[in-house]
């Protein structure tokens, strides 16, 4: 009775398609395979971002897989050989593992980099980035943003640099055709006559960098002797009514702040006869039904009613 | 005759623990792979969990890991769901499902009866 | 993760129509596609596996096709015992091993 082997995967390559981070893992069938013709073999595939306590595992009929890397840190994966249990008298068969890496060199120190880099993706329309220089770069060095996501044929270089004393500390993006609810990878990398510059890789979803516009046509509708309805309507733009929640802050007669926060464009105030001036403002941020983060807007204008008996019917501003 | 047969489902605080058991006959059930798969009352399948014939490889759904535990017992025939720090949207029937062909998952040939799991408090 | 869409939501259908079923994927999954049926309160069974072959002691009126992203299932003439659920499933790649939202056949 011998004993039933099975070779890993040959050629086990990751590449780098130019996608900023988005790579392929590839490979071959494994040698001496005509025994198991009739078999269909699996491959469990483990990789990770050098550095991480967790390999992220899959198995795969295929011979090949792509996922996103922080090109920041380098990247290890392995694969092996499965023969399930139908192929092997009811055995299971794994073969040894075959492993790679890939990093990219780094060029230049990590202080050259981009510092602070920031994304924001205004009303779910208008992506802008920002950074600051590297530390102790000089005037001659420049910075140059690359972007790609699921849907482009390949890196697209900035357009429109945001500058400051002739160097560039941001992008304007343009309309960016189905690119939310997936990966979008930038790379901001450098040049100087002087000395090289590290390259920075950023990763993240546009839904969860949003900040929307502020609410609009804030209102008051007195409800009954003691309870007075505040209602706002939705920012103009593409996010839907579903999305928001509301911070509200409501200050009566100078003294009392009341906070809170609400998934509807109402919120009804219990309130005294005694309440002489009402003032609240509204603020809006995508909700966790729409992405897992978000930035609040700023603060509607002010609407405040003052001097006039609040137990009339309607209060508008 | 191949048979599955769940239990160990119930109501449960939301954070408690629970402990599925699947019960597995009329099968060479030591080489093959088994899997947990969930339905939400009035909604879809959901796959949670599997584990290879062996027990050597386990496999989870993203929902699920950290709080659950697949385990099998080849010598009882039994395959097992511990569940910890349960969630209400676990509440679901939990079926067992023997793998048809395959290394930790596939087609499922054949499933248990299914057993329900309602975490409330 | 593949997705995978099933289309039609709800089917009406009657007693002896063809039905037809669509499931696409997200990326390619070569032939490695299940369709199962459910009714109320009951286990799914398993119909067809490896996108076309029929499983053991299901009714020969029902048939698989597809690869790729692009799968159907086909009812040939509809019986009183084919109104259920229908999911598709892949297991090409995983995890997560992924179903389909489901396609109810109800009577027209």
């Known amino acids: 009775d011998t004993e039933i082997k099975v070779n890993p995967p040959q050629d086990f390559e990751i590449v780098d398609p130019g996608y900023l981070g988005y790579l392929y893992l590839q490979w071959q069938p494994p040698l001496s395979l005509d025994h198991f013709k009739e078999c269909t073999v699996e491959y469990e595939l483990k990789y990770r971002n050098i550095g991480s306590e967790t390999w992220k595992t899959i198995i795969t009929k295929n011979l090949h897989y792509k996922d996103g890397f922080d090109l920041n840190k380098g990247i290890e994966a392995k694969i092996h050989t499965l023969l399930p249990w139908q192929c092997t008298n009811g055995s299971e068969v794994q073969s040894s593992w075959a492993e790679t890496t890939y990093w990219i060199s780094p060029q230049g120190i990590p202080e050259t980099k981009v510092q602070d880099m920031d994304c924001v993706y205004y009303n779910w329309q208008y992506l802008l980035c920002s950074w600051k220089p590297g530390i102790g770069v000089l005037l001659d060095t420049n910075y140059n943003l690359f972007y790609w996501y699921e849907g482009l044929d390949h890196a697209l270089q900035c357009v429109d640099y945001i500058k400051a004393d002739g160097q560039n500390i941001g992008c304007r993006f343009p309309y960016l055709e189905a690119s939310d609810y997936k990966d979008f990878y930038i790379c901001v990398n450098g040049s100087s006559e002087n000395k090289p510059i590290r390259s920075s890789y950023f990763t993240f979803q546009l839904q969860n960098i949003v900040k929307p516009l502020p609410p609009v046509y804030l209102t008051f509708t007195r409800e009954s002797s003691c309870e007075i309805k505040l209602k706002w309507s939705i920012p103009l733009g593409p996010i839907p009514a579903r999305c928001f929640d509301y911070e509200i802050e409501i200050r009566e007669d100078d003294t009392t702040l009341v906070t809170a926060t609400v998934e509807n464009e109402t919120y009804t105030l219990k309130t005294t006869n005694e309440t002489r001036q009402l003032c609240f403002v509204v603020r809006s941020k995508v909700n966790i039904y729409c992405s897992d983060d978000g930035i609040w807007s700023e603060w509607s204008d002010k609407q405040c009613w003052e001097g006039e008996d609040l137990s009339k019917k309607t209060l508008l501003r | 005759e191949v048979q599955l047969l769940e239990s160990g489902g119930g109501l449960v605080q939301p954070g408690g623990s629970l402990r599925l058991s699947c019960a597995a006959s009329?099968?060479?059930?030591?080489?093959?792979?088994m899997s947990w798969v969930r339905q939400a009352p009035g909604k879809g399948l959901e796959w949670v969990s599997s584990i290879s014939g062996s027990a050597g490889s386990t496999y989870y759904a993203d929902s699920v890991k950290g709080r659950f535990t697949i385990s099998r017992d080849n010598s009882k025939n039994t395959l097992y769901l511990q569940m910890n720090s349960l969630r209400a949207e676990d509440t679901a029937v939990y079926y067992c499902?023997?793998?048809?062909?395959?290394w930790g998952a596939g087609a499922f040939d054949y499933w248990g009866q299914g057993t329900l799991v309602t975490v409330s408090s | 993760d593949i997705q995978m869409t099933q289309s039609p939501s709800t089917l009406s259908a009657s007693v002896g129509d063809r039905v037809t079923i669509t499931c696409r994927a997200s990326?390619?999954?070569?032939?490695?596609l299940a369709w199962y049926q459910q009714k109320p309160g009951k286990a799914p069974k398993l119909l067809i596996y490896d996108a076309s072959s029929l499983e053991s002691g299901v009714p020969s009126r029902f048939s698989g096709s597809g690869s790729g992203t692009e799968f159907t299932l086909t009812i040939s003439s509809l019986q009183p015992d084919d109104f259920a659920t229908y999911y598709c499933?892949?297991?090409?790649?995983?995890?997560?091993?992924?179903f389909g939202q489901g396609t109810k056949v109800e009577i027209k």
């Open positions: 499902a023997k793998v048809r062909y395959g």
């Open positions: 990326q390619s999954i070569s032939s490695w």
């Open positions: 499933q892949q297991y090409d790649t995983y995890p997560p091993i992924t």
């Open positions: 009329g099968f060479t059930f030591g080489t093959i792979p």
